[in-house]
C-alpha cells in the first residue's frame, strides 16, 4: 500500500489557446486530469489501472501552482494504491479549459483540451522527488513526482506491513525496511520475550518484564541462585531446594532436635559444668556447696554427705566434722578398722584381706559398687547410647531408646530412609545424614520425582498453514508463529488480502 504523489509546479500557455489552436474566451481557465496506469511501452488510452485524480481550476493561461490545498484541490495530488508497487508506471496528464463550473468529462466539449502529456518508466519507492518538464508547441508543464509507502507499510515495494506496538503481542518499532526493531529490554522474533536481569539464573529464574528476575519455586535471592530450605526445617540450611541440612548442634529430619542443649540454653547455674547427654537432655556437675538438677540450690557442706561408712556430719564455722562409727576413722570415716572377720561386704560382695589383715577390700557382684558394695550401679552414667539415644535403667540391665533414623543396641546403626522406595517414576534414592534425596529421571521433578515436567506441547502439531510451533517450557503450552497472511492462536484464519490486478 502506498501513494503516487504528483506535484504540479508551473503551467505556461502564453497565448491562451486550446490544443486545436482556438483561443479560450476570455482566457483558458485551466484544470488537470491525471491518469496513472501500469507500464505500457506505448502509452495508449484505456483504464487508469492505478487510479485517476482531477484538480479544480488552478489558474488561467500561465500560472504557478502553490504546493498546498488550492481551491479545494490538493497539491501534491495523491494517487493511492493498495498493492505491491511494481516499480514501473505510465502517467497521462491532461490540461483542460473549463468554460463553466461543471468539470465533469461529459459536461465539457471535446475541443476543451489544452494539452496532453504521456510518460512512462521505472520509479523506485523513495522520499526524493523526480523533477520533469514537458513542452509542446504551445504549452509547457513543470512538475515532480514520487512514490511513498502508506503509514505502516515498508520496503522497496511497500509490501511489508509493520505497525509499531508496545503490548502483550510485541514491543517494537519499525525499521525503514519494515523489519522489527525491539524496544530496549525485549528480544525474540516479535520482541515478546523480556531480557531478564543480568545474571538471573537461567534455570531457576525467569521474568515477565525487562530487568526482572523472578524465582521458580524453591529458589530465592536477587539472581535466584539461593535455595529455600524445607517448610518444616527449623535450624538448617540447603544446597538444593527443600533440603534441611542441620546447623551445628541440631539433629533430626527437620533439624529441630537440640543436640547441644548446653550451648543453646546454658541451663547449669552457679558455675556448674554442663554435659550434653542426648536430645534436649543434659547433666550439670555442680561445684561444691550446690545441688539440684541445674545446681540452682545452695547447700551446707554437710548436705553433700561427705562422711562415709555411716559417719555423721557436724557443720562447723570453717567446714564440717565427721563423727565416725565404731571400726572407722579418717577425715571422712573412709578408713576401716574392720577386717574380713567382721563381714563388712554387703549385697553378696566377697571380702579380701589386705596388709596382713590390717584392712580389707570388697569385690562386688554385678550391679553393686562402693567400698562395701553398698551402692547400686547406675548403668547409664557412662552415656553408652550413641546418636542422641536415651539410656533407660531396666533392673539388672540397661537399654537405649533411639532417635528416629537410628537403631541397634546402642543406636549405633543408621536406618536407611531409602528402604521404603520413596522415589517415584524410577527416581534414584540417596541416603543423607538427615533424610534422603531423590535423583529424578528426565521429565520428572519434585522432592520425590512426583511432578511430570517438560511436556512437548508441539508434539500434536497444533499449528495450521505451515506455521512454526514453539513450546513454552514455563507453562507447557504452545505458541504458533504464523506465516504472512494468516492469524489466530493456531494460524487458522487467512487475512483478507486485496484482489489481484490484471497487469
Amino acid at each position: 500500500s502506498g501513494v503516487f504523489q504528483l506535484q504540479l509546479q508551473e503551467f505556461i500557455n502564453e497565448r491562451g489557446v486550446l490544443a486545436s489552436g482556438r483561443p479560450c474566451e476570455p482566457g483558458c481557465r485551466t484544470f488537470f486530469r491525471v491518469c496513472l496506469k501500469h507500464f505500457q511501452a506505448v502509452v495508449s488510452p484505456g483504464p487508469c489501472t492505478f487510479g485517476t485524480v482531477s484538480t479544480p481550476v488552478l489558474g488561467t493561461n500561465s500560472f504557478a501552482v502553490r504546493d498546498d490545498s488550492s481551491g479545494g484541490g490538493r497539491n501534491p495530488l495523491q494517487l493511492p494504491f493498495n498493492f505491491t508497487w511494481p516499480g514501473t508506471f505510465s502517467l497521462i496528464i491532461e490540461a483542460w479549459h473549463a468554460p463553466g463550473d461543471d468539470l465533469r468529462p461529459e459536461a465539457l466539449p471535446p475541443d476543451a483540451l489544452i494539452s496532453k502529456i504521456a510518460i512512462q518508466g521505472s520509479l523506485a519507492v523513495g522520499q526524493n522527488w523526480l523533477l520533469d518538464e514537458q513542452t509542446s508547441t504551445l504549452t509547457r508543464l513543470r512538475y515532480s513526482y514520487r512514490v511513498i509507502c502508506s503509514d505502516n507499510y515498508y520496503g522497496d515495494n511497500c509490501s511489508r506491513l509493520c505497525k509499531k506496538r508496545n503490548d502483550h503481542f510485541g514491543h517494537y518499532v519499525c525499521q525503514p525496511d519494515g523489519n522489527l526493531s525491539c524496544l530496549p529490554g525485549w528480544t525474540g522474533e516479535y520482541c515478546q520475550q523480556p531480557i531478564c536481569l543480568s545474571g538471573c539464573h537461567e534455570q531457576n529464574g525467569y521474568c515477565s518484564k525487562p530487568a526482572e528476575c523472578l524465582c521458580r519455586p524453591g529458589w530465592q535471592g536477587r539472581l535466584c541462585n539461593e535455595c529455600i530450605p524445607h517448610n518444616g526445617c527449623r535450624h538448617g540450611t540447603c544446597s538444593t531446594p527443600w533440603q534441611c541440612t542441620c546447623d551445628e548442634g541440631w539433629g533430626g529430619l527437620f533439624c529441630d532436635q537440640d543436640l547441644n542443649y548446653c550451648t543453646h540454653h546454658s541451663p547449669c547455674k552457679n558455675g556448674a559444668t554442663c554435659s550434653n547427654s542426648g536430645q534436649r537432655s543434659y547433666t550439670c556437675t555442680c561445684r561444691p556447696g550446690y545441688t539440684g538438677v541445674d545446681c540452682e540450690l545452695e547447700l551446707s557442706e554437710c548436705d553433700s554427705n561427705p562422711c562415709r561408712n555411716g559417719g555423721s556430719c557436724k557443720d562447723q564455722e570453717d567446714g564440717y566434722h565427721c563423727l565416725c562409727p565404731p571400726g572407722y576413722y579418717g577425715l571422712h570415716c573412709e578408713h576401716s578398722t574392720l577386717s574380713c572377720a567382721d563381714s563388712p561386704c554387703f549385697n553378696g560382695g566377697s571380702c579380701r584381706e589386705r596388709n596382713q589383715g590390717a584392712n580389707y577390700a570388697c569385690e562386688c557382684p554385678p550391679n553393686f559398687t562402693g567400698s562395701n558394695c553398698e551402692k547400686k550401679v547406675d548403668r547409664c552414667t557412662s552415656n553408652p547410647c550413641a546418636n542422641g539415644g536415651q539410656c533407660l535403667n531396666r533392673g539388672p540391665s540397661r537399654m537405649c531408646r533411639c532417635r528416629p533414623g537410628f537403631t541397634g543396641t546402642y543406636c549405633e546403626l543408621h536406618v536407611s530412609d531409602c528402604a521404603r522406595n520413596p522415589c517415584a517414576h524410577g527416581g534414584t534414592c540417596h541416603d543423607l545424614e538427615n533424610g534422603l534425596m531423590c535423583t529424578c529421571p528426565a521429565g520428572f521433578s519434585g522432592r520425590r520425582c512426583e511432578v511430570r515436567t517438560s511436556i512437548d506441547a508441539c508434539a500434536s502439531s497444533p499449528c495450521f498453514n505451515r506455521a512454526t510451533c514453539y513450546t513454552d517450557l514455563s507453562t507447557d503450552t504452545f505458541v504458533c508463529n504464523c506465516p504472512y497472511g494468516f492469524v489466530g492462536s493456531r494460524c487458522e484464519f487467512p487475512v483478507g488480502l486485496p484482489p489481484s490486478f490484471p497487469w
Epitope: 515477565s208 523472578l214 524465582c215 521458580r216 519455586p217 524453591g218 529458589w219 530465592q220 535471592g221 536477587r222 539461593e226 529455600i228 530450605p229 517448610n231 518444616g232 526445617c233 527449623r234 535450624h235 538448617g236 540450611t237 546447623d247 519434585g446 522432592r447 512426583e450 511432578v451 515436567t453 507453562t475 507447557d476 503450552t477
Partner: antibody
Framework: EVQLVESGGGLVQPGGSLRLSCAAS????????MAWVRQAPGKGLEWVAT????????YYRDSVKGRFTISRDNAKNSLYLQMNSLRAEDTAVYYC???????????WGQGTLVTVSS | DIQMTQSPSSLSASVGDRVTITCRAS??????LAWYQQKPGKAPKLLIF???NLADGVPSRFSGSGSGTDFTLTISSLQPEDFATYYC?????????FGQGTKLEIK
C-alpha cells in the same frame, strides 16, 4: 517451638505512616525468607511483600509498591514493614509469615490490626 | 496474576462426614499449591503443600490431590475442630495468590 509475634499496629489517618515489627524465635531466622500477608476485615488473604534470607531481595504486590518497605535484622531475629502514605484500603490484619512468594507460608504470627481511617 | 477460584464458598456438614473442597487455577500451576485452615480470630495454619504433602502435625484425615489447574482438599471424617475457613494458594507464578476461601460450617 516456632513463634512469630507481630506488633506496631493501630489506628492511623489516611496518608499517615506505621512501622510493623515481627519477633521470630524457635528457628534460625537468618536461614529463611520471610513475608507479610494481610487480611482485610471479613475478606480473604492477600500477599503483601517478601524478603529473601541472605541478600535481602524484596518483592511487593503492585498496590503497595513505593509505599511499603519490608526489611529484616538477622542479628535481632526481627522482620519489619514500614508503611507510608496509608490508604483506607490498607486496613487489615497484617500477618508475619515464614515463606517466599514461591513457597508455602509455613508459619504465621497471630497478626496485628492496622486501621486507616479519618 | 493467576486467579484461584474455590468452590463451594460455604459448606454445611456433620461430624463424621467426608468433605471435598475444590480449587481451580486460571492457568497451569503444576503441583505448586498449598491449603490453609483458619479459625475465627486466629492466624491461618499450613495444612498441605505441594498439592498432597501433609505439613508437620496435621492429622492424616486431611489429604490433597490434583495437578495443573484443578485441585481438591479432602477431609475423610470431619471432626469438631475441623469447622473453619479453608484457603488454597498457588506459589508457581509471581505474585502468589489465594483463593477466596471456603467456610465449612456445622450442619
Amino acid at each position: 517451638e516456632v513463634q512469630l509475634v507481630e506488633s506496631g499496629g493501630g489506628l492511623v489517618q489516611p496518608g499517615g505512616s506505621l512501622r510493623l515489627s515481627c519477633a521470630a524465635s524457635g528457628f534460625t531466622f537468618s536461614n529463611f525468607p520471610m513475608a507479610w500477608v494481610r487480611q482485610a476485615p471479613g475478606k480473604g488473604l492477600e500477599w503483601v511483600a517478601t524478603i529473601s534470607s541472605s541478600d535481602g531481595t524484596t518483592y511487593y504486590r503492585d498496590s503497595v509498591k513505593g509505599r511499603f518497605t519490608i526489611s529484616r535484622d538477622n542479628a535481632k531475629n526481627s522482620l519489619y514493614l514500614q508503611m507510608n502514605s496509608l490508604r483506607a484500603e490498607d486496613t487489615a490484619v497484617y500477618y508475619c509469615s515464614r515463606g517466599y512468594y514461591n513457597s508455602p507460608f509455613a508459619y504465621w504470627g497471630q497478626g496485628t490490626l492496622v486501621t486507616v481511617s479519618s | 496474576d493467576i486467579q484461584m477460584t474455590q468452590s463451594p464458598s460455604s459448606l454445611s456438614a456433620s461430624v463424621g462426614d467426608r468433605v471435598t473442597i475444590t480449587c481451580r487455577a486460571s492457568e497451569d500451576i503444576y503441583s505448586n499449591l498449598a491449603w490453609y485452615q483458619q479459625k475465627p480470630g486466629k492466624a491461618p495454619k499450613l495444612l498441605i503443600f505441594d498439592t498432597n504433602n501433609l505439613a508437620d502435625g496435621v492429622p492424616s484425615r486431611f489429604s490433597g490431590s490434583g495437578s495443573g489447574t484443578d485441585f481438591t482438599l479432602t477431609i475423610s471424617s470431619l471432626q469438631p475442630e475441623d469447622f473453619a475457613t479453608y484457603y488454597c494458594q498457588q506459589y508457581n507464578n509471581y505474585p502468589p495468590t489465594f483463593g477466596q476461601g471456603t467456610k465449612l460450617e456445622i450442619k
